[in-house]
Interface confidence: low
C-alpha cells in the first residue's frame, strides 16, 4: 500500500519558506494550543450506559510520551436498573492522531510521524444481527 | 527517516527531551489510512446516542480532512425508537495533534497542533441541577 | 460560566400568541443543544422544543403545528413563537441548553444548562 505523503504539490512555495533537504520535513514540536486543559462533561465515562475506563501508555521515545486509551468495560449496556443488558452492545468509538517516534540508529537518531488510533470512549448501539441461513 | 548526529562522543544516557525542531521523513507510518468514519463503522446510526457527521476542511492543516460529530438529540434513543428526555446525550472530545503549515502555504514546514474534535457521541444520567 | 436568561412570558387569551426568547452569555465556546421545557402546576418538566447546532429541530406531539422553534447563532439566542395557545399549555417555561464552554481556563465540553423560567398563563 502507498504511504501518504503530507506534502502538497498544489502549494505554491513562498519564498520565506525555510529549506529542507529532500524527502524530509521540518517540523517544530512546540505544540500550538498545548495549554488548553480540557474536561468532558464530568464523569461522563461513569456516568454513560456504555462506561469505560482508561489506561495511559508511556513511551519515553514517542512525543507526546503520554497516550491515554479508553477500555469499554461492558460487553453490553447498562440499564435503566444499574444491570448490564447484553442485547445491546458496548463499542468502542476510536480517532487517528498524530505522533512522532524517536529511533536511534547507531549514535544517530531519526524521527518518524506515525499515526496513532485512540480509543477516546465507548457508546451503546443496537446490535447487527447475523441471520444463520 | 532522516538521520540527526547526536551529541559527540555519542553519551550513554537516554535524551530526556525532544528537541523543539526536528526533521522527519515525508512519509508517515501508519496502518489507519481509512479517515472517513462514515465508511470505518455505521455506529453513528446504530448509537442509543446517534450523531452525524460533519466534514472539516483545511488544506493549511494535515489531515486536510477532519471528520467531527454533532449529537442528533439532547436525549437518547430508547428501546421503543422514541427520544428519552431523562438521559442525555453527549458528545465525547478529544484532543488530537496534527499539522499546521507554518510559515503558512510551505509545503514542508509543519507546527505540531492540539485540537479539539468531537469523535461521537454517548448516552449519559444527566447530572440533576436542584434548584434552591 | 454560563448564564441563560428568558423573556416574553406573560397572560394570553386562549388562541392568542406569545414570543419566548432566551440568550446564553458566558464564555461559551460552542452551544450544541438550545431549547425550551415546561413545567405546569403539580407536574414534572417536559420537553417543549429543541433546536440542533445543524438547524434541525424536535417538538413534542402536543406542540407540532402550533410552536415554532428558532435560532439565532450571532447572538447566541433561541426563540419559541407560541400560536394557537391554549389553557393547557400554561407552565412555567425553562430555557435549556448544552454548552461547551471555558470556565477557569478549563473547558467543559458539554454541559445543560437552565434558565431561571418565565410563566406563561393562558386563560380567558
Known amino acids: 500500500r502507498k504511504i501518504p505523503k503530507v506534502g502538497h504539490t498544489f502549494f505554491q512555495k513562498p519564498e520565506s519558506c525555510p529549506p529542507v533537504p529532500g524527502g524530509s520535513m521540518k517540523l517544530d514540536i512546540g505544540i500550538i494550543n498545548e495549554n488548553q486543559r480540557v474536561s468532558m462533561s464530568r464523569n461522563i465515562e461513569s456516568r454513560s450506559t456504555s462506561p469505560w475506563n482508561y489506561t495511559v501508555t508511556w513511551d519515553p521515545n514517542r512525543y507526546p510520551s503520554e497516550v491515554v486509551q479508553a477500555q469499554c468495560r461492558n460487553l453490553g449496556c447498562i440499564n435503566a436498573q444499574g444491570k448490564e443488558d447484553i442485547s445491546m452492545n458496548s463499542v468502542p468509538i476510536q480517532q487517528e492522531t498524530l505522533v512522532v517516534r524517536r529511533k536511534h540508529q547507531g549514535c544517530s537518531v531519526s524521527f518518524q510521524l506515525e499515526k496513532v488510533l485512540v480509543t477516546v470512549g465507548c457508546t451503546c448501539v443496537t446490535p447487527v444481527i447475523h441471520h444463520v441461513q | 527517516g532522516i538521520t540527526i548526529p547526536r551529541n559527540p562522543g555519542c553519551p550513554n544516557s537516554e535524551d530526556k527531551n525532544f528537541p523543539r525542531t526536528v526533521m522527519v521523513n515525508l512519509n508517515i507510518h501508519n496502518r489507519n489510512t481509512n479517515t472517513n468514519p462514515k465508511r470505518s463503522s455505521d455506529y453513528y446510526n446504530r448509537s442509543t446516542s446517534p450523531w452525524n457527521l460533519h466534514r472539516n476542511e483545511d488544506p493549511e492543516r494535515y489531515p486536510s480532512v477532519i471528520w467531527e460529530a454533532k449529537c442528533r438529540h439532547l436525549g437518547c434513543i430508547n428501546a421503543d425508537g422514541n427520544v428519552d428526555y431523562h438521559m442525555n446525550s453527549v458528545p465525547i472530545q478529544q484532543e488530537i495533534l496534527v499539522l499546521r503549515r507554518e510559515p503558512p502555504h510551505c509545503p514542508n514546514s509543519f507546527r505540531l497542533e492540539k485540537i479539539l474534535v468531537s469523535v461521537g457521541c454517548t448516552c449519559v444520567t444527566p447530572i440533576v441541577h436542584h434548584v434552591a | 460560566e454560563v448564564q441563560l436568561v428568558e423573556s416574553g412570558g406573560g397572560l394570553v387569551q386562549p388562541g392568542g400568541s406569545l414570543r419566548l426568547s432566551c440568550t446564553a452569555s458566558?464564555?461559551?465556546?460552542?452551544?450544541?443543544?438550545m431549547g425550551w421545557y415546561r413545567q405546569a402546576p403539580g407536574k414534572q418538566r417536559e420537553l417543549v422544543a429543541l433546536i440542533f447546532s445543524g438547524g434541525s429541530a424536535d417538538y413534542a406531539d402536543s406542540v407540532k403545528g402550533r410552536f415554532t422553534i428558532s435560532r439565532d447563532n450571532s447572538k447566541n439566542t433561541v426563540y419559541l413563537q407560541m400560536n394557537s395557545l391554549r389553557a393547557e399549555d400554561t407552565a412555567v417555561y425553562y430555557c435549556a441548553a448544552e454548552i461547551g464552554y471555558y470556565s477557569g481556563g478549563t473547558y467543559y465540553s458539554s454541559e445543560a444548562h437552565w434558565g431561571q423560567g418565565t410563566l406563561v398563563t393562558v386563560s380567558s
Open positions: 458566558g464564555t461559551i465556546v460552542n452551544i450544541h443543544v
